[in-house]
Amino acid sequence: QGWQAFKNDATEIIPELGEYPEPPPELENNKTMNRAENGGRPPHHPFETKDVSEYSCRELHFTRYVTDGPCRSAKPVTELVCSGQCGPARLLPNAIGRGKWWRPSGPDFRCIPDRYRAQRVQLLCPGGEAPRARKVRLVASCKCKRLTRFHNQSELKDFGTEAARPQKGRKPRPRARSAKANQAELENAY
């Protein structure tokens, strides 16, 4: 039931571009005056185990233009992709490179989007049509969830439940790593 990443059929992948495009300057923005004193969503720690870093999830970046009908973004946006399986953190860094992947003997754990962020985009349209302003939904972070036997996206279960979210200041918006996402990694996504 949840939003599926990459539902937008028309995307152009540009792996060589790595930085987030700067959003247009915000107008009359008095956001800072209106912040919740401890505003924001705290980090999601899905694993309430002895060692939070015991399991890990691969986050890839790639850059593309976004489209809305015949209109295309003036600048590309950098997207985060949650890739493949979840496994012990110590195995993950080399796992893809060696073509190996850690698989749990029990239930299947999947790396899926956790938080989302908005990015303002201006869309340029053909035929003299007025430009459009939109806010695109991008993945901000990934998490591991357990697939139930139905293997249905709506049946993904959290590794652990999260307590009531205190309003602690957090910005989940990730800064871009210099991301040259290679195609093999992209094919592993989701």
Epitope: G2, N8, K31, R134, R173
Partner: antibody, heavy 121, light 110 residues
Framework: EVQLVQSGAEVKKPGASVKVSCKVS????????MHWVRQAPGKGLEWMGG????????IYAQKFQGRVTMTEDTSTDTAYMELSSLRSEDTAVYYC??????????????WGQGTLVTVSS | QAVVTQEPSLTVSPGGTVTLTCGSS?????????PYWFQQKPGQAPRTLIS???DKHSWTPARFSGSLLGGKAALTLSGAQPEDEAEYYC?????????FGGGTKLTVLG
């Protein structure tokens, strides 16, 4: 399809606090951007605050700064809006509203049924 | 804080056309204010008609359209129906802070 169900009507005395809940179904709360809007009897809509996904922070309207707190319990997919130091002019219907979790952010697409809060001595 | 202005009331005949406008005290309304339009009938929660200046929703009747006109956001109703009688609110985004207009009471004179 996102659905929002709010808690029932409340009657409060001036100076008290009220906490209104908004239960999300169809999606998880972390996929959505939740906002709160109120409407005094016979008056217009007034934005109180909400989660800004551009920088991951909750923003409150200046008018309510220091009196309102918006929180979320992601284990139950329930959002809360607490308003303190109530006065008679806070008597209103309080709505939660969220986006539709689509590819483009469209805020205020889905609305709760509203919670009437009456402040009276 | 910005003030968002709307006509307090407008009247249209069935089948007629009417345009509601939404202005900002800070200057011209642009696409970067992501104008929204809502319809509210007595005793009901509001419902979104238009997002991001001109983007209709699956439930928005084709007779409603959004645009920018002369430095304001505009909602045009072409071919008014009796069921369109309602209060209409616009909403502007000031970089994450939102402000509603005071609302326009639209009467469809039968």
């Amino acid at each position: 399809e996102v659905q929002l169900v709010q808690s029932g009507a409340e009657v409060k005395k001036p100076g008290a606090s009220v906490k209104v809940s908004c239960k999300v179904s169809g999606y998880t709360l972390t996929e959505l951007s939740m906002h709160w809007v109120r409407q005094a009897p016979g008056k217009g809509l007034e934005w109180m605050g909400g989660f800004d996904p551009e920088d991951g922070e909750t923003i409150y309207a200046q008018k309510f700064q220091g009196r309102v707190t918006m929180t979320e319990d992601t284990s139950t997919d329930t959002a809360y809006m607490e308003l303190s130091s109530l006065r008679s002019e806070d008597t209103a219907v309080y709505y939660c509203a969220t986006d539709s979790a689509g590819y483009w952010y469209k805020f205020f697409q889905h609305w709760g049924q509203g919670t009437l809060v009456t402040v009276s001595s | 804080q910005a003030v968002v202005t709307q006509e307090p009331s407008l009247t249209v005949s069935p089948g007629g056309t009417v345009t509601l406008t939404c202005g900002s005290s800070t200057g011209a309304v642009t696409i970067d204010h992501y104008p929204y339009w809502f319809q509210q009938k007595p005793g009901q929660a509001p419902r979104t008609l238009i997002s991001d200046t001109d983007d209709k929703h699956s439930w928005t009747p084709a007779r409603f359209s959004g645009s920018l006109l002369g430095g304001k956001a505009a909602l045009t109703l072409s071919g008014a129906q009796p069921e369109d009688e309602a209060e209409y609110y616009c909403l502007l985004d000031y970089g994450g802070t939102f402000v509603f207009g005071g609302g326009t009471k639209l009467t469809v004179l039968g």
